[in-house]
Amino acid sequence: QGHLVHMTVVSGSNVTLNISESLPENYKQLTWFYTFDQKIVEWDSRKSKYFESKFKGRVRLDPQSGALYISKVQKEDNSTYIMRVLKKTGNEQEWKIKLQVLDPVPKPVIKIEKIEDMDDNCYLKLSCVIPGESVNYTWYGDKRPFPKELQNSVLETTLMPHNYSRCYTCQVSNSVSSKNGTVCLSPPCTLARSEQKLISEEDLGGEQKLISEEDLHHHHHH
């Protein structure tokens, strides 16, 4: 009775809600519900009826498979969808699909919280900022991943000369998308002592660059 399937999709996509098994033979009626009481569509004796709901005009039922096609899902469509089938015997069978609609993650901005040269070691604190999202973080130094225990929104680490990196990348991801932000230091970890600055690829229209004080006079930095 309680078949529950989880589906995660990206907002703006077209989605087909369907069950993995065949429908009962010669069923009498099939109904899709949004949550538990809001009918979306009902198929009854060779005819579909679409109900007035927020889905009207953007759903279509395939009565042969029972699949419900929804165009352009949005986060507000997050819900449990129920397909209820009335068999010839009079028994009902029910399938549930929990649909989670996620927005693609935005591009992260890396903020330099602190950078300090300490006895040839480099203390680095970078934060990866995106607007209130539940995401996973992965940090890379020159494209090599940092250890798992450092994988959160703030990268705080002390680097030794042999493992300095010029560029640091924060990858944010959810189950439907991922985006990167990268910053580069020039030269590694001497930002405070020399008057060199750091600029993110965001500011440079996606390019990744090493940048120094004199470049900044010709580049408007937000």
Epitope: N14, V41, K47, S48, K49, Y50, F51, E52, K56, G57, R58, V59, R60, L61, D62, Y69, S71, K72
Partner: antibody, heavy 120, light 109 residues
Framework: QVQLVQSGAEAREPGASVRVSCKAS????????IHWVRQAPGQGLEWMGW????????NFAQKFQGRVTMTRDTSLITAYMDLSRLKSDDAAVFYC?????????????WGQGTLVTVSS | EIVLTQSPATLSLSPGERATLSCRAS??????LAWYQQKPGQAPRLLIY???NRATGIPARFSGSGSGTDFTLTISRLEPEDFAVYYC???????????FGQGTRLEIK
């Protein structure tokens, strides 16, 4: 039985507006979308848009955005299509049609068509 | 925007013959395609929807097949009243809009 009866032929000058009506009978008017389709002489079918008679919500083909208005009067079980700033190439037969099952996908009952001529 | 291309533009056959009309979509429309028949001076009539479902009252000699981008309307044995123009139709999702193919004229040979 389901029927859609449209208003009669209209002649207009360029720049004017035209209103075509479509009176429904034989089914629950608010359960199904009403679509408007036009057909220029000797040409194919061109979808203009739909109205949901229950909510009054409309959706138009991009080509007609800003020039077409679709309304309905549920007490008169009638849908209306207004097309403004008419040009000579707007001359066509305009059809209203009901969709097959309330999904907005296919058109199964059609009006008889309304001929609109546009010339100065 | 999805474009539907019908072929041939004109098909000349005799009553009793089998007619095969084709409709190709510029990108996949799954099974969401319909076929209409239009006779001179008349409104179109829905024949097939969801690629293969016959609309109410449509004779069994009309059948539809296909999915994705390639669809076929078959008339198994042509009757004199079947000579007309046939259109395929699909619905795009966003913004929701309906498009028709340019039509195939089925004429008596």
């Amino acid at each position: 039985q389901v029927q859609l009866v449209q208003s009669g032929a209209e002649a207009r000058e360029p720049g004017a507006s035209v209103r075509v009506s479509c009176k429904a009978s034989g089914y629950t008017f608010t359960d199904y979308f009403i679509h408007w389709v036009r057909q220029a002489p000797g040409q194919g079918l061109e979808w203009m848009g739909w109205i949901n008679p229950n909510s009054g919500a409309t959706n138009f083909a991009q080509k007609f955005q800003g020039r077409v208005t679709m309304t309905r009067d549920t007490s008169l079980i009638t849908a209306y299509m207004d097309l403004s700033r008419l040009k000579s190439d707007d001359a066509a037969v305009f059809y209203c049609a009901r969709d097959v099952d309330g999904s907005g996908w296919y058109l199964d009952f059609w009006g008889q068509g309304t001929l609109v001529t546009v010339s100065s | 925007e999805i474009v539907l291309t019908q072929s041939p533009a004109t098909l000349s056959l005799s009553p009793g013959e089998r007619a095969t009309l084709s409709c190709r979509a510029s990108q996949s429309v799954s099974i969401y395609l319909a076929w209409y028949q239009q006779k001179p001076g008349q409104a179109p009539r829905l024949l097939i929807y969801d690629a293969s479902n016959r609309a109410t009252g449509i004779p069994a000699r009309f059948s539809g097949s296909g999915s994705g981008t390639d669809f076929t309307l078959t008339i198994s044995r042509l009757e004199p009243e079947d000579f007309a123009v046939y259109y395929c139709q699909q619905r795009s999702d966003w913004p929701p809009s309906i498009t028709f193919g340019q039509g195939t004229r089925l004429e008596i040979k």
